[in-house]
């Protein structure tokens, strides 16, 4: 008789999830000498231990603490780039500007990027059929709790000037309900961070509006200022040109507004 299985609203665990996590860990530790000491089998065991045999709507940050400990990593605190709804450009930027780091440039972020996972209460099985959706099912699911945990720690570590890339094509350029808006903004440490600088990325070719005046950006400025952190904002009108100028800043075309 087939066992009854909970059906969730979200996609199931990414296929070959254990193999993917392990392979990513090995690759990352080979490329980053400062993480060569990491035992990837132990990392996978800690990752698995955070959600296997647990109800996928009842995951806590505490469940991920063994993984957090194994994945402890020091990134330069003044070289942090946060992002919201514009991950690809943020990653393209840090691939060129190698001294800047997004969360996905750290071991733990790299392991989990674009993956989904969940288990089932009281069985050691991984659920490849469905996993809880944050809105439709529950917020304390394995994926959401993981990203909340690592995002909080990443923001807490930041210092000096912190940059955030925001998507100027969205109706809410700054969204209070995004990971940036709900977690990272509130975990920047005012005693360490002097300024948050938003880079608002324009989508349209002929869009010359000052999106730094957008009401949601003003809302972000208000939240940040109340936390005793300075706020600055920069329009990036041509993201393609911006990336070219990061790659080749001496190019004559880079003297005009990006």
């Amino acid at each position: 008789v087939p066992r009854w299985r909970q059906q969730w609203s979200g996609p199931g665990t990414t296929k070959r999830f254990p193999e993917t996590v392990l392979a990513r860990c090995v690759k990352y530790t080979e490329i980053h000498p400062e993480m060569r000491h990491v035992d990837c089998q132990s990392v996978w065991d800690a990752f698995k231990g955070a959600f296997i045999s647990k109800h996928p709507c009842n995951i806590t940050e505490e469940d991920y603490q063994p993984l957090m400990k194994l994945g402890t990593q020091t990134v330069p605190c003044n070289k942090i780039l946060l992002w919201s709804r514009i991950k690809d450009l943020a990653h393209q930027f840090t691939q060129v500007q190698r001294d800047m780091f997004t969360l996905e440039d750290t071991l733990l972020g790299y392991l989990a990027d674009d993956l989904t996972w969940c288990g089932e209460f009281n069985t050691s099985k991984i659920n490849y059929q469905s996993c809880p959706d944050w809105r439709k099912d529950c917020s304390n699911n394995p994926v959401s709790v993981f990203w909340k945990t690592v995002s909080r720690r990443f923001a807490e570590a930041a210092c000096d000037v912190v940059h955030v890339m925001l998507n100027g094509s969205r109706s809410k350029i700054f969204d209070k309900n995004s990971t940036f808006g709900s977690v990272e903004v509130h975990n920047l440490q005012p005693e360490k961070v002097q300024t948050l600088e938003a880079w608002v990325i324009h989508g349209g070719r002929e869009d010359s509006r000052d999106l730094c005046q957008d009401p949601t950006i003003k809302e972000l400025e208000s939240i940040i200022s109340k936390r005793n952190i300075q706020f600055s904002c920069k329009n990036i009108y041509r993201p393609d040109k911006f990336l070219q100028c990061v790659k080749n800043p001496e190019d004559s075309s880079c003297t005009s507004e990006i």
């Epitope: 500007q97 000037v161 948050l196 600088e197 938003a198 300075q230 600055s232 904002c233 920069k234 003297t255």
Partner: nanobody
Framework: EVQLVESGGGLVQAGGSLRLSCAVS????????MGWFRQAPGKEREFVAA???????LYADSVKGRFTLSRDNPKNTAYLQMDSLKPEDTAVYFC????????????????WGQGTQVTVSS
């Protein structure tokens, strides 16, 4: 070729003010983060303040609340307004440029000016 030229230094009494300027030519100033450093005789070059290409600011604890950074992109110039000056602010002040983001370490800056002397008498 990128050139940085500081001006505005001089002799001032303790409690007084000076405004330093750093004019940039030959480069994409609007993409520069500008840093200010100082060096007193026999001492290491010390970070003072920096401003990003988006005008975000960063100050050393020793000058916070007394010094103010700004930039004028059309004029290709960065400014360091120094108020409530103290004798320990006496040094040669250098401006430096790097692309996009700030840093505290002198080694991260690609372009440097020749420096301008600031002397604060008691």
């Amino acid at each position: 070729e990128v050139q940085l030229v500081e001006s505005g230094g001089g002799l001032v009494q303790a409690g007084g003010s000076l405004r330093l300027s750093c004019a940039v030519s030959g480069g994409a100033f609007n993409n520069f983060a500008m840093g200010w450093f100082r060096q007193a005789p026999g001492k290491e070059r010390e970070f003072v303040a920096a401003i990003t290409w988006g005008s975000g600011t960063l100050y050393a604890d020793s000058v916070k609340g007394r010094f103010t950074l700004s930039r004028d992109n059309p004029k290709n110039t960065a400014y360091l307004q120094m108020d409530s000056l103290k004798p320990e602010d006496t040094a040669v002040y250098f401006c430096a440029g790097k692309y996009f983001t700030t840093a505290r370490l002198p080694a991260e800056y690609k372009y440097w000016g020749q420096g301008t002397q600031v002397t604060v008498s008691s």
